[in-house]
Interface confidence: low
């Protein structure tokens, strides 16, 4: 670490005095201090002498000696006071610029340490400091305003009491700049716009920032638009608003509009699309298949997407039959708006009953007319089976009726013994009926099929079983040829 002679932390001299400051280090050394006149510098290797024959108040300040070659970067300092009775202050800078919430050092250096007790900071023309100004004083460095605020951007003077009167420094202008967190905040309203040719339209591009220095413009496709700008200041933010008013839109007004704002921190932009149409439109669509199949007892949500301009004047869900004249309950119909011109309408059908199969239509109306989208809902049922013994053309025949949806497949089994259901060990014979006769097949109803099994003689210690199955489940009926009749087995889900 270099050493300074005289080896005192502070030195007080009178104006006109000769001052010699000598710094010695292991290697070459350098002086650093306030810019002031009359200093002469002599250097020879490891020592450097700073001297003046005519010290003035402007030589007041801290002089630091450093050794550039020292890896530890050590330094030594001495503070020089040149106590001029007429000049209590040496001001090192007349303008100080800081960001908000930083400490602002106003570098008025006291030329006489004795005056420290009577110093104060004031605004120019003797005005007091603003309330809540938190500051401290160091005779070596000056006044520090802690956590400076934008409104503290003022002209200040340092005041010292000399012989009962206040002596002011020259003024120091403090500029406290707002910390700009980033590019201006932007809004572009609306986010999307549709108009019929000839209608009026308005697009508003607004930007705001804590600092007034920012630019904003509205761009249509690649055209930068010249629009009168409105400026405002509220909630501690500067706001610039561009309002594009179009009395009668035409197709050339359509396209992409970008609101762009920029400041020193960068650029923000947001875009919207303006669509101009020849006439009102109303489009209905669904991501679902319009033909729906659901197992009885389960639930279903029917969804319709609507794209419309102008807005809808009416909409509803309607049940078109064929079973009952019930209409969907309004509480089961739900609407959500994705954005201004697109909506989703949902009809919830929980725990579907047989009477709720059929056609459901969503109807919507706007100035463009009526549109409807119709769903066909078919319920799926597991097969129900029954078997009877009869004679057809003189032949004994087992007749199996199976009812369900989708159309059931039929299999006959003959097994030994009397049982409610044939198991593999008992099975004597199996017949698949690939083409059972369809007895009824109406839309939204179960399909009923009939299968015939001709039996010359009924074996009395055997069971004949008709099994039916579809994608939902299976059902069976066991026929036991005894005088008591037949046993049935309920459908399996």
């Amino acid at each position: 670490i270099p050493v300074i002679e005289p080896s005192v932390p502070e030195l007080v001299v009178k104006p006109g005095a000769t001052v010699t400051l000598r710094c010695v280090g292991n290697g070459s050394v350098e002086w650093d201090g306030p810019p002031s006149p009359h200093w002469t510098l002599y250097s020879d290797g490891s020592s450097s002498i700073l001297s003046t024959n005519n010290a003035t108040f402007q030589n007041t300040g801290t002089y630091r000696c450093t050794e550039p070659g020292d890896p530890l970067g050590g330094s030594a300092a001495i503070h020089l006071y040149v106590k001029d009775p007429a000049r209590p202050w040496n001001v090192l800078a007349q303008e100080v610029v800081v960001f908000e919430d930083q400490d602002a050092l106003l570098p008025c250096l006291l030329t006489d340490p004795v005056l420290e007790a009577g110093v104060s900071l004031v605004r120019v023309r003797g005005r007091p400091l603003m309330r809540h100004t938190n500051y401290s004083f160091s005779p070596w460095h000056g006044f520090t305003i802690h956590r400076a605020k934008f409104i503290q951007s003022q002209d200040y003077q340092c005041s010292a009491l000399m012989g009962g009167r206040k002596v002011m420094s020259i003024s120091i202008r403090l500029k406290v700049q707002k910390v700009i967190p980033g590019p201006p905040a932007l809004t572009l309203v609306p986010a999307e716009l549709v108009r019929i040719r000839g209608e009026a339209a308005q697009i508003v591009c607004s930007a705001s920032s804590v600092d007034v220095n920012f630019d904003v413009f509205l761009q249509h496709n690649n055209t930068k638009l010249a629009i009168p700008q409105q400026s405002d200041f509220h909630n501690n933010r500067y706001q610039k608003v561009l309002t594009l008013n179009l009395d009668q839109v035409d197709f050339q007004h359509a396209g992409n509009y970008s609101c762009v704002a920029s400041n020193v921190q960068g650029k923000h932009s947001t875009s919207m699309f303006f669509r101009v149409v020849e006439s009102a439109y109303l489009n209905l669509s669904s991501e679902q298949n319009l033909i729906q199949e659901v197992t009885v007892g389960e639930g279903l949500n029917l969804k319709v997407m609507v794209e419309a301009y102008p807005g809808l004047q009416g909409f509803n869900w309607t049940y078109l039959g064929p079973f009952s004249d019930h209409q969907p309950e309004p509480k089961l119909a739900n609407a959500t708006t994705k954005d201004t011109y697109r909506h989703t309408f949902t009809l919830s059908l929980p725990r579907l009953k047989p009477s709720e199969a059929g056609r459901y239509s969503f109807l919507a109306r706007n100035p463009g007319g009526w549109r409807a989208l119709t769903f066909e809902l078919t319920l799926r049922y597991p097969p129900e089976v029954s078997v009877i013994w009869t004679f057809i053309n003189g032949s004994g025949t087992l007749l199996c009726a199976a009812s369900g949806y989708p159309q059931p497949n039929v299999t006959w089994l003959q097994c030994s013994g009397h049982t409610d259901r044939c198991d593999e060990a008992q099975v004597l014979q199996v017949w698949d009926d690939p083409y059972p006769e369809v007895l009824s097949q109406e839309p939204f109803h179960k399909v009923t099929v009939q299968s015939l099994l001709t039996v010359e003689t009924l074996e009395h210690n055997q069971t004949y079983e008709c099994r039916a199955h579809n994608s939902v489940g299976s059902g069976s009926w066991a026929f036991i040829p005894i005088s008591a009749g037949a046993h049935t087995h309920p459908p399996d889900e």
Partner: antibody
């Protein structure tokens, strides 16, 4: 004082090329679209080409499409017109002009500030 | 691309009112701009947006536009107004700037 100064004109043979420049001063160049307009001796004004403020969009009169190319360098406050395959009918005084694109009530464009022009003569 | 029709010449005595027309199909739906060009000089914008005046242009210059005709009106004509006058529109469909053929205004001595 807003100023546009054209340069690069001269005498050129049919089929030849020229590059016109327009230097802008005293206004925010990149706020404006720019246009080239020409005037044949003793004739009226004919719009030639335009370029948007950021160079993203260009368009041309049918008479020069495919032969002329408009470009700009906002960093240098300069506008250019590259003219290839020149014909005798391209002989004219060529003006550059700052083009204001307005969208207030209606969309429209007009030419606000004009340079003094540079003369292009195409002759064998 | 619609053409704009201007009379080749208009003559007026000093102090009188000059009216220069610019015809075009449904020109009233477009915005019309007017330029003045004196001999040997570049054109100067005198009216834009049908009826607005740039700063520095005397109030004597005014414009109107409706139907199929736009009109530039110069009241209290002075000798210094003698020039060629051009109307201009922006053809939206082609994105081209279109000029009229020009009208030579003569101030009678």
């Amino acid at each position: 004082q807003v100023q546009l100064v054209e340069s690069g004109g001269g005498l050129v043979r049919p089929g030849g090329s020229l590059r016109l420049s327009c230097a802008a001063s005293e206004f925010t160049f990149d706020d404006y679209a720019m246009s080239w307009v020409r005037q044949a001796p003793g004739k009226g004004l004919e719009w030639v080409s335009a370029i948007s403020w950021n160079g993203g969009s260009t368009n041309y009169a049918d008479s020069v499409k495919g032969r002329f190319t408009i470009s700009r360098d906002n960093a240098k406050n300069s506008l250019y017109l590259q003219m290839n395959s020149l014909r005798a009918e391209d002989t004219a005084l060529y003006y550059c002009a700052s083009t204001v694109e307005v969208a207030h009530r209606r969309l429209y464009k007009y030419l606000e500030v004009w340079g003094q022009g540079t003369l292009v003569t195409v002759s064998s | 691309q619609a053409g704009l029709t201007q009379p080749p010449s208009v003559s007026v005595a000093p102090g009188q009112t000059a009216r220069i027309t610019c015809g075009g199909n449904n020109i009233g739906s477009k915005s019309v701009h007017w330029y003045q060009q004196k001999p040997g000089q570049a054109p100067v914008l005198v009216v834009y947006g049908d009826s607005d005046r740039p700063s520095g242009i005397p109030e004597r210059f005014s414009g109107s536009n409706s139907g199929n005709t736009a009109t530039l009106t110069i009241s209290r004509v002075e000798a210094g107004d003698e020039a060629d006058y051009y109307c201009q529109v922006w053809d939206i469909s082609s994105d081209h700037v279109v000029f009229g053929g020009g009208t030579q205004l003569t101030v009678l001595r």
